[in-house]
């Protein structure tokens, strides 16, 4: 009743290993690390056979097949490169995930290297079986912004890609009789979120109630240069419109809002987010230079009343930008307190512009980002949003533009976007 001698499979072993096997002896076939027992096209960890009464084995010895991790999962905004020849996906093969640079960067500077494990899953030393995350890079235009020479009133044409975060927000309120249409600017914060001023997205009511426009009435254009040619731009509808809950129409305090886009936009040379600042109650330091872009009025001789009566005829076709210094808070407060009317400059605002006038933001630039270059991170950071100005025409002497101090709202912004700050560390000014 002796059974024939057994040969262990290639890359495998049999236990117990004996010189002879008799009736009722059992043998367990297993494979080396990185291999699986294959019997009748079924993979298993071990396989047991028995020596039968008639001196035959209950089954043939199975084979050992190398573990295959199969094609790795797709990475959103990322690429996969195979380190092993012939793009092998078997045990100990290596792949490397990378993000679509320069528009996306891997979270936490992960190596992106994954190895096919003995269990048949792609494993990373830090993330385990989880895929890495490609986050949008912020504040790094593909085209270098110009050197801040002194001297969008008094502005100049922006080259395409110079302000890749710039969004044109068009609101067409069809619930109004007659239909109401206006526009403003915004800044891309991520592939799905636009930062803007609350007054841009407040329904233009006949009273001072703060009610947001319906999301159906909002269209956002990104990668736009010339408003006459929207063919190259990405346009998106809004999934959500979020005004700051404390926005005050009487003094424009808390003039900040967000638009969540219906679909994430693909990033590229003309569409890239701007960075958010650190939570910083002081805001940008006096005399720091910043840039603002917009399609607002670029003619310094046009009065506000003419702008309002002529609709959109006085707007710029090509994106304009201007360079402005931050004005000391006390100086700005004083300049507005000397005017008749409710012109309070709160701690949630800062001013920018020149005493002598000539350069300013204007109607239609509302909601646009006032960006400052951060030397530490070498990125452009949104420190302000175009909010309001004095009663005189834009660019008047000693009439500074007033901006929402974004650094006071960083927590609110992250909260609305539903992202814990730790996850979005690369998005924050360092």
């Amino acid at each position: 009743n002796e059974c024939p001698e057994l040969q262990p499979p290639v890359h495998g072993k049999i236990e117990p290993s004996q010189a002879k096997y008799f009736f009722k002896d059992q043998v367990l076939v297993s494979c080396d690390t990185g291999y699986k027992v294959l019997k009748d096209n079924v993979e298993m960890d071990t396989f047991q056979i028995e020596c039968l009464k008639d001196g035959t084995w209950s089954n043939k010895i199975p084979t050992c097949k190398i573990v295959d991790c199969r094609a790795p999962g797709e990475l959103e905004h990322g690429l996969i490169t195979f380190s092993t020849r012939n793009n092998l996906t078997t045990y100990k093969s290596e792949i490397k995930y990378s993000c679509q640079e320069p528009y996306y960067k891997m979270l936490n500077n992960n190596t992106g290297i994954y190895t096919c494990s003995a269990q048949g899953v792609w494993m990373n030393k830090v993330l385990g079986r989880s895929l890495p995350t490609c986050l949008p890079e912020c504040g790094q235009p593909s085209r270098s912004l110009p050197s801040l020479v002194k001297r969008i009133i008094g502005g100049r044409n922006a080259e395409p890609g110079l302000f890749p975060w710039q969004a044109l927000i068009v609101v067409e309120d069809t619930s109004r009789v007659p239909n109401d249409k206006w526009f403003g600017s915004g800044a891309l914060l991520s592939a799905s979120w636009i930062l803007t001023a609350a007054h841009v997205l407040r329904s233009q009511r006949r009273d001072t109630t703060v009610i947001p426009v319906s999301k159906e009435h909002v269209t956002v254009y990104l990668g736009l240069h010339d408003v006459r040619d929207k063919s190259g731009a990405v346009n998106s509808s809004a999934a959500r419109v979020v005004l700051h809950p404390d926005f005050n129409i009487q003094n424009y305090n808390h003039d900040i809002a967000l638009v969540q886009l219906q679909e994430p936009v693909p990033l590229g040379p003309h569409v890239m987010p701007v960075c958010l600042p650190r939570l910083e109650p002081e805001g940008p330091a006096p005399h720091m230079l910043g840039l603002v872009a917009g399609w607002g009025i670029s003619n310094p001789n046009v009065t506000v009343d003419e702008i309002i009566s002529s609709g959109t005829r006085t707007l710029s076709d090509v994106l304009q930008y201007v360079k402005l210094p931050v004005v000391p808070h006390a100086e700005c407060k004083t300049s507005y307190e000397s005017r008749s009317g409710n012109y309070s400059v709160t701690e949630n605002m800062f001013c920018a512009g020149y005493y002598e006038g000539g350069k300013d933001t204007c109607l239609g630039d509302s909601g646009g980002a006032f960006v400052i270059f951060d030397d530490l991170s070498q990125r452009w950071v949104v420190q302000g949003l175009v909010s309001w100005g004095g009663p005189e025409e834009c660019g008047s002497k000693q009439v500074y533009g007033v901006y929402t101090k974004v650094s006071n709202y960083v927590d609110w912004v992250w909260e609305q976007m539903g992202l814990p700050q730790s996850v979005v560390e690369p998005q924050v000014e360092r």
Partner: antibody, heavy 114, light 112 residues
Framework: QVQLVQSGAEVKKPGASVKVSCKAS????????INWVRQAPGQGLEWIGW????????KYNDKFKDKATLTVDTSSNTAYMELSSLRSEDTAVYYC???????WGQGTLVTVSS | DIVMTQSPDSLAVSLGERATINCKSS????????????LAWYQQKPGQPPKLLIY???TRESGVPDRFSGSGSGTDFTLTISSLQAEDVAVYYC????????FGQGTKVEIK
């Protein structure tokens, strides 16, 4: 077309309550607020308050804070105004309006009499 | 609270003549940010709800005849009917919407 249809006239005794309804049609009910205004016989217009159906926000004229309660039922596109502790001086025509007073209900006469 | 005062209380004007109603507010209705005056004018005929004529002090509501015009800024406002028609006989109210809402006491316009 836009319409605001109010409930019919009511006669109530002093101390009682009354609930007036205003059913909206022809526009998206949640996109605009509903205002309530009253007009006593031979008198002028007085604003009572407003409600925003999208988030149930309300604002009241101080004079009516303890008198009127505004609610909405978005499933039936209907706004309600409940008046409590009625007195003879609450006898008036009560109007609802929407789309910033572009459209008005026909008015509901509430008479308070013992 | 903002108080609205209309003058005169009543006005008799011949057909085809100009009718002018004034409205004064206890504080400015001009919002320095939006650059709008939050004042509206309404017309009310007997047994009917009010009808909006003018908003933002001077913007005519859709469908309102151009003989109706509004002017003024800050605290002083005027409604003008350039050529009174028989169908214009009504009570006219101003209303502020700068801070909640307050109506004026009304001005009755009749034909002389």
């Amino acid at each position: 077309q836009v319409q605001l249809v109010q409930s019919g006239a009511e006669v109530k005794k002093p101390g009682a309550s009354v609930k007036v309804s205003c059913k909206a049609s022809g526009y998206t009910f949640t996109t605009d607020d509903i205002n309530w205004v009253r007009q006593a016989p031979g008198q002028g217009l007085e604003w009572i308050g407003w409600i925003y159906p999208r988030d149930d926000r309300t604002k009241y004229n101080d004079k009516f804070k303890d008198k009127a309660t505004l609610t909405v039922d978005t499933s039936s596109n209907t706004a309600y105004m409940e008046l409590s502790s009625l007195r003879s001086e609450d006898t008036a025509v009560y109007y609802c309006s929407s789309l910033e007073d572009t459209y008005w209900g026909q008015g509901t006469l509430v008479t308070v009499s013992s | 609270d903002i108080v609205m005062t209309q003058s005169p209380d009543s006005l008799a004007v011949s057909l085809g003549e100009r009718a002018t109603i004034n409205c004064k507010s206890s504080q400015s209705l001009l919002n320095s940010r939006t650059r709008k005056n939050y004042l509206a004018w309404y017309q009310q005929k007997p047994g009917q709800p009010p009808k909006l004529l003018i908003y933002w002090a001077s913007t005519r509501e859709s469908g309102v005849p151009d003989r109706f015009s509004g002017s003024g800024s800050g605290t002083d406002f005027t409604l003008t009917i350039s050529s009174l028609q028989a169908e214009d006989v009504a009570v006219y109210y101003c209303k502020q919407s700068y801070n909640l809402y307050t109506f004026g006491q009304g001005t009755k316009v009749e034909i002389k």
